[in-house]
Interface confidence: medium
């Protein structure tokens, strides 16, 4: 029996269901008697799902699993993750028995966007150019840890002072604030990208400063 | 490379029970399946049955089933037969086998190096 | 339970002797068969599985055939260290069955 995965990872958003693809060509004749399906995490080995002597052995993952049982007397071992979490990311192995064995890993990359940043400025009245200013950008849920730019006005990289820190929350999404310290000029804006290296999605905030008043 | 090693001879009266150990190391042991393989003296070899440690699913051959268990405990990688009510027809070398990592679970490429099991009065 | 029946049960043959074993089952096991060399005190070694692959490491003047029923094991030019027990098994069901062996001793 030849066992057969996507070699890409699967890409699943935080609380929605990811599906792990894992596929057998079944000989003729075949019964699901004969079937042995495990899946497991492949590195520490622990049970997620399985299905042996003839029937659904159930889900030993936080019950959050599940076969397509219609599909798999077609070959179809895959498996069904339900409301996936930060702590499912990882490589999954579906090892397929029937006489032969085989076995073949899929990994589940987790993800989640990053919200709009929200941009703060200190301190934010009676500023003058030449003024040293802490601009922050904060942007917060996502998964996995950002990339964050800065650039000024006409689009080129602020890479000066900048210290940027993410914290996981209890859920294992990252909170992201990065602050840039500059000199202000006469006008001038500040532009902040959050950037989900797994979705490749941009979330971008600003700041304009025209001497009096602010914009964002 | 999976070695199996197994606990040591033992003589056995009728009509009480016996429970051999097998060792596994150099292989992923609680994914794949372990079979117990019984020799007599001078004959061939007989399928007892097998577990898989990962699931803690055993199955007999009907021939030895109410008076075999097989169990597992993953976190020192050996498996147990344990026969119960032995008869002298029971003496037998006893092996436990598995494919391995990258084989079957019903073909054996490693075997470990047999335990006698002697019943007598 | 399916039935397996080796054939003979004793050979006797000389170095560089080209051997065959039959091995019979009592039903259609497909190609779920696997042959196996014991020598005395050991245990037994995986030669043959899936009626036809050589299993790694095995030397190639070992081969297998057959299919269904009736399936076969042929050492080409027999070595002095092939004089041993040889052990068809099937795998298409439960419970797995051996064939009674087949001694290939020194004439």
């Known amino acids: 029996v030849e066992v057969q995965v996507s070699e890409d990872p699967v890409v699943a958003l935080v609380d929605t269901d990811a599906t792990l693809r894992c596929s057998f060509s079944p000989e003729p004749g075949f019964s699901l008697r004969q079937l042995n399906l495990i899946w497991q995490l492949t590195d520490t080995k622990q049970l997620v799902h399985s299905f042996t002597e003839g029937r659904d052995q159930g889900s030993a993952y936080a019950n959050r699993t599940a076969l397509f049982p219609d599909l798999l007397v077609q070959g179809n071992a895959s498996l069904r993750l339900q409301r996936v979490r930060v702590t499912d990311e990882g490589s999954y192995t579906c090892f397929v028995s029937i006489q032969d064995f085989d076995s073949a890993a899929v990994s589940l990359q987790v993800a989640a966007p990053y919200s709009k940043p929200s941009m703060t400025l200190e301190p934010n009245k009676d500023l003058r150019p030449g003024d040293m200013v802490t601009i922050t950008c904060s942007s917060y849920q996502g998964y996995p840890e950002a990339e964050v730019f800065w650039k000024d006005g006409q689009g080129l990289p602020l890479t000066g002072n900048v210290t940027t820190s993410q914290m996981a929350n209890e859920r294992g999404l990252f909170d992201v604030h990065s602050v840039l310290r500059v000199v202000l000029g006469a006008n001038g804006t500040y532009s902040c990208l959050v950037r989900n290296p797994v979705l490749q999605q941009d979330a971008h905030g600003s700041v304009t400063i025209t001497g009096q008043p602010m914009t964002f | 490379q999976v070695q199996l090693v197994e606990s040591g001879a033992e003589v056995k009266k009728p009509g009480s029970s016996v429970k051999v150990s097998c060792k596994a190391s150099g292989g992923t042991f609680s994914s794949y399946a372990i079979s117990w393989v019984r020799q007599a003296p001078g004959q061939g070899l007989e399928w007892m049955g097998r577990?898989?440690?990962?699931?803690?699913?055993?199955n007999y051959a009907q021939k030895f089933q109410g008076r075999v268990t097989i169990t597992a405990d993953k976190s020192t990688s050996t498996a147990y037969m344990e026969l119960s009510s032995l008869r002298s027809e029971d003496t037998a070398v006893y092996y436990c086998?598995?494919?391995?990592?990258?084989?079957?679970?019903?073909?054996?490429?490693?075997w470990g190096q047999g335990t006698l099991i002697t019943v007598s009065s | 339970d399916i039935q397996m029946t080796q054939s003979p049960s004793t050979l006797s043959a000389s170095v560089g002797d080209r051997l065959t074993i039959t091995c019979r089952a009592s039903?259609?096991?497909?190609?779920?068969l696997a042959w196996y060399q014991q020598k005395p005190g050991k245990a037994p070694k995986l030669l043959i599985y899936?009626?036809?692959y050589l299993q790694t490491g095995v030397p190639s003047r070992f081969s297998g055939s057959g299919s269904g029923t009736e399936f076969t094991l042929t050492i080409t030019s027999l070595q002095p260290d092939d004089f041993a027990s040889y052990y068809c098994?099937?795998?298409?069901?439960?419970?797995?069955?051996f064939g009674g062996g087949t001694k290939v001793e020194i004439k």
């Open positions: 577990i898989i440690p990962i699931l803690g699913i055993a």
């Open positions: 098994q099937q795998y298409d069901s439960n419970p797995l069955t």
């Open positions: 086998a598995n494919g391995g990592d990258s084989s079957s679970w019903y073909t054996f490429d490693y």
């Open positions: 039903q259609n096991i497909n190609s779920w």
């Open positions: 899936k009626a036809s």
